[in-house]
């Protein structure tokens, strides 16, 4: 059976029907359906006016405008809001009421596309294998990234989150139109990896999506990941404005100027250094989501009531931090180079600025405990990877799972750890599953391009597709049309159960309490440490171009610090605010050919895509299970002003009193302020745009970051918090 032309809200579309073997099964593929009008720079997406005749949806459209991997030119287009659909078909009737899976790509909110990299004439995010093996409809789409997707002044002049609103437009389009393709509009599952996983999480928390999403899967990224929310957007907006010659003294004038600046110039005005970094990569990425008081009405930690009815899977790769650790500390992948205590202490101190010397020392001590018994370089390098994995991915994911569970009504919660080792031959043998290694298995690459893979890789891929698509069908990864290798138990706050995904799976694959000691450390011990004040945490911003390596902090910490013996000398302070996700060198969707895998085939595996970040804001709590953070103040208090030289600190996300940014839709009315302190009343929705949602009740409205004082830009506020 095949669909032929399908009528959508924009008009008729016609795809391609691809036959699958001799049994008569096929897949209808639609590429390049517009889900919104061509974008205007730094404006919310608008509905597409439609077309006459039948749109031939046979080729992927260009990605959204972004810098190339070399960051010296751009590719993609401003007219980029298109989606792609794969519909599996049997021999006789056309499919009806199929579950729908919508993929959100990663790439640091800086790069990427709905189709991904092309290798062996097969795109990374080609939905065919998932669709046909799992009997689900797969949808992928483009959204704006980088400055065009996320530049914000932190107020109503440029509220930001344009890329998130693009994502929402795609989700809403699917809800309204997917029935015509044979999908069930009441059974939509979002899934995504890295910045895409965090986006999935944010979409479930946004009041704009109320009633649109049934289930969600976050792979290596959640809304609570420390690289997801930009707390000092004005700093980054000004960096770009200066570069393109816009005035920075007045936010309204700056915003108007930025809107009429050549989008390519805006894109190229922001560069991320990829080598010779003085600080961890996460400190250099500034264009990510913000708390705008509207689409993201409050700190994500306080929005979990909005996801109370959404089934949720979240997980990480066992060495998600490897790619970032190897950029921050290149010795990790070099057998002839050593990681020293000094190196690691310096890295730790850069992640723990807000807790000063004690934060650096206690964290260093916790992570190096095993070094006494095993001082081998392999153990030390694994420690560095574990540290970045914990901070950037694992701990925030555990907190997100605990929050989801604590707020869930009927919804189920599942956790996983993906441990099938990386196939990059240039990596040391001890490297496990690196960031983005999971994507190729979810998208069935071992089946689509078999020459690059081994039978064990197909086993992993088959299992992941089965769990993922069963979950999309029923909300339970064990139940559906696909057999699974072992039973995956739900996550509860009591058992902290998670499924370890490997090439050999059985009853022992169901495990409990992943890295509990480290989780407890970050959410209890570290959180309780006092936040440093005044000059103890005075960051020095990058000088000149935003891509320039920042000047290191002045004072004793210019040289690599040694582990402290007393309480002298504050650790070095990184240059930026608390957000950002570095790009991964060859990203999953760059054109650069990936390194071929080991084994007997020359076909490469999918290279890492994705992003990174900074430490999470942990909850308080006192039990052994991952503590559920309070719904009020979401973490450490904000860093106090650093002397008289910097902009004011980010207000606390608790009861700060600062008014929310007025909504950016048609309505000028501000969001309704909450009454009472209930944690579970979900935020009422609004539609695709316009009328503002009511922020959640509770004692934390997470007022959007106020614009920083234009006259004092000498230093950047240190707002990295756990």
């Amino acid at each position: 059976a095949k669909l032929g032309a399908v009528y959508t809200e924009g008009g008729f579309v016609e795809g391609v029907n691809k036959k699958l073997g001799l049994l008569g099964d096929s897949v209808d593929i639609f590429k390049g359906i517009p889900f919104a009008a061509p974008t205007k720079a730094l404006e919310n997406p608008q509905p597409h006016p439609g077309w006459q005749g039948t749109l031939k949806a046979k080729n992927f459209k260009k990605r959204c405008l972004q810098a190339t991997i070399t960051q010296d030119s751009t590719y993609g287009d401003e007219d980029c809001l298109y989606l792609n659909i794969w519909v599996p078909q049997g021999r006789k009737q056309v499919s009806r009421d199929l579950p729908v899976m919508i993929w959100i790509y990663g790439g640091a909110f800086l790069m990427g596309s709905g189709h991904g990299a092309n290798f062996l004439n097969n795109y990374l995010y080609d939905g065919e294998e998932i669709a046909t093996r799992g009997n689900v409809i797969v949808v992928t789409f483009n959204y704006r990234v980088g400055p065009l997707g996320f530049l914000s002044t932190g107020d109503a002049n440029l509220p930001g989150n344009y890329g998130l609103r693009d994502q929402h437009m795609a989700i809403a389009w699917v809800k309204r139109n997917i029935a015509a393709f044979g999908g069930d509009p009441n059974n939509i599952t979002l899934f995504g990896e890295s910045a895409g996983g965090a986006s999935v999480s944010l979409q479930t928390l946004s009041p704009y999506n109320k009633g649109l999403i049934r289930r969600a899967i976050s792979q290596s990224g959640v809304a609570l990941s420390p690289w997801v929310i930009q707390k000092n957007p004005l700093f980054w907006a000004k960096k770009v404005a200066e570069k393109v010659g816009c005035p920075v003294g007045d936010a309204a004038r700056m915003a108007q100027c930025l809107k009429v600046t050549d989008p390519r110039a805006l894109t190229l005005a922001y560069k991320v250094p990829l080598a010779g970094l003085e600080y961890p990569m996460l400190h250099y990425v500034g264009f990510v989501p913000v708390i705008d008081g509207d689409f993201i009405p409050a700190d994500p930690i306080n929005l979990y009531a909005n996801a109370a009815d959404i089934d949720y899977i979240a997980g990480t790769n066992n060495m998600d931090g490897h790619i970032f650790a190897s950029i921050d500390m290149p010795a990790i992948n070099k057998g002839n180079k050593k990681v020293t205590e000094e190196d690691f202490y310096k890295l730790v101190s850069e992640f723990t600025i807000t807790k000063g010397l004690r934060g650096a020392k206690t964290t260093f001590d916790v992570y190096t405990e095993s070094w006494a018994q095993d001082p081998s370089q392999e153990n030390k390098k694994k420690t560095v990877v574990d540290f970045e994995t914990d901070v950037l991915f694992l701990v925030p994911t555990e907190i997100a799972l605990a929050q989801h569970r604590a707020n869930a009504k009927s919804a189920k919660t599942y956790a996983y750890l993906f441990s099938h080792p990386s196939r990059m031959p240039v990596y040391p043998k001890w490297v496990g599953a690196d960031h983005a290694d999971d994507i190729q298995y979810v998208f069935g690459k071992p089946f689509a391009t078999p020459t690059g893979y081994r039978p064990q890789d197909r086993t992993v891929s088959k299992a992941m597709i089965a769990y993922w698509t069963n979950f999309a069908k029923t909300g339970d990864p064990n139940m559906g049309d696909s057999a699974v290798p072992t039973h995956w138990e739900p996550y509860t706050t009591e058992n902290s159960g998670y499924l370890e995904i490997t090439k050999k799976m059985g009853s022992s694959s169901m495990k409990r309490s992943l890295r509990t000691n480290f989780l407890r450390y970050w959410t209890l011990t570290y959180l309780a440490l006092p936040t440093v004040t005044d000059q103890e945490a005075t960051p020095v911003p990058p000088t000149g171009d935003s891509e320039a390596t920042p000047v290191p902090p002045t004072g004793d910490s210019e040289t690599a610090p040694v582990p402290p013996t007393g309480d002298s000398g504050a650790p070095p302070v990184p240059p930026t605010g608390d957000s950002g996700a570095p790009p991964v060198p060859p990203t999953g969707d760059s054109g650069a050919p990936p390194v071929p895998p080991t084994g007997d085939s020359g076909a490469p595996p999918v290279p890492p895509t994705g992003d990174s970040g900074a430490p999470p804001v942990p909850p308080t709590g006192d039990s052994g299970a991952p503590p559920v953070p309070p719904t009020g103040d979401s973490g450490a208090p904000p860093v106090p002003p650093t002397g008289d030289a910097g902009p004011p600190p980010v207000p606390p996300t608790g009861d700060s009193g600062a008014p929310p940014v007025p909504p950016t839709g048609d309505s000028g009315a501000p969001p309704v302020t909450p009454t009472g302190d209930s944690e579970t009343a979900p935020v009422p929705p609004t539609g695709d745009s316009g009328a503002p949602p009511v922020p959640p009740t509770g004692d934390s409205e997470a007022a959007p970051v106020p614009p920083t004082d234009d006259s004092k830009e000498a230093q950047m506020p240190a707002v990295i918090r756990f």
Epitope: G4, A5, V6, Y7, T8, E9, G10, G11, F12, E14, P47, H48, P49, G50, W51, Q52, G53, T54, M169, A172, W173, K175, R176, N177, A179, A180, Y208, G211, L212, P685, T686, G687, D688
Partner: antibody
């Protein structure tokens, strides 16, 4: 100017079929989708389906799937709507309506055709 | 299917009055169209894409809203405006509201 002229009123017995025509003029026939909307006596408007006169592609509302067929004749710039297995509740005025621009705003309407289903 | 709920279902007003008719969509929609229908006549397009006036429609008619809540406003009622008004959503299966009958008080 755009004109849509529909065929005359019909009286049909339950179980029979009816075929209503809609002749278009004043614009390029194959460039705009044509929709069919019906209105039962004293009731609201109900969308039945749409045809692209350019390639004949159709889409029908779930409620009418299997009972309705929309066709076109480009040589006479006419679209047709046939409804089978008629029941008394199909008694209504049937309108053809052309897209205004883009998609979905129904900018130009025929005068309507009353179909009465009665035994 | 997307549900469209119009309110009120009927309304009495006088010439010169300002009148507002609302239409609520569930779930949210992208665009809304408004039509006017007089007894024994075919409907006539008034407003398309939420707020754009169809050609030949007087400027006293205006539309606004987004997401789930939309309004049609007639700023100063004229005798010829007494009719039934329908909203319509645009999706793969367009649906109309049940109509609002505007009568002379």
């Amino acid at each position: 100017q755009v004109q849509l002229v529909q065929s005359g009123a019909e009286v049909k017995k339950p179980g029979a079929s009816v075929k209503v025509s809609c002749k278009a003029s004043g614009y390029t026939f194959t460039s705009y989708n044509m929709h069919w909307v019906r209105q039962a006596p004293g009731q609201g408007l109900e969308w039945m389906g749409v045809i692209n006169p350019g390639d004949g592609a159709t889409s029908y509302a779930q409620k009418f799937q299997g009972r309705v067929t929309m066709t076109r004749d480009t040589s006479t710039s006419t679209v047709y709507m046939e409804l089978s297995s008629l029941r008394s509740e199909d008694t209504a005025v049937y309108y053809c309506a052309r897209d205004y621009y883009g998609s979905s705003p129904l900018g130009y309407w025929g005068q309507g055709t009353l179909v009465t289903v009665s035994s | 299917d997307i549900q469209m709920t119009q309110s009120p279902s009927s309304l009495s007003a006088s010439v010169g009055d300002r009148v507002t008719i609302t239409c609520r969509a569930s779930p949210s929609i992208s665009y809304l169209n408004w039509y006017q229908q007089k007894p024994g006549k075919a409907p006539k397009l008034l407003i398309y894409a939420t707020s754009s006036l169809a050609s030949g429609v007087p400027s006293r008619f205006s539309g606004s809203g987004s997401g789930t809540d939309f309004t049609l406003t007639i700023s100063s009622l004229q005798p010829e405006d007494f009719a039934t008004y329908y909203c319509q959503q645009r999706s793969s299966s367009p649906t109309f509201g049940q109509g609002t009958k505007l009568e002379i008080k």
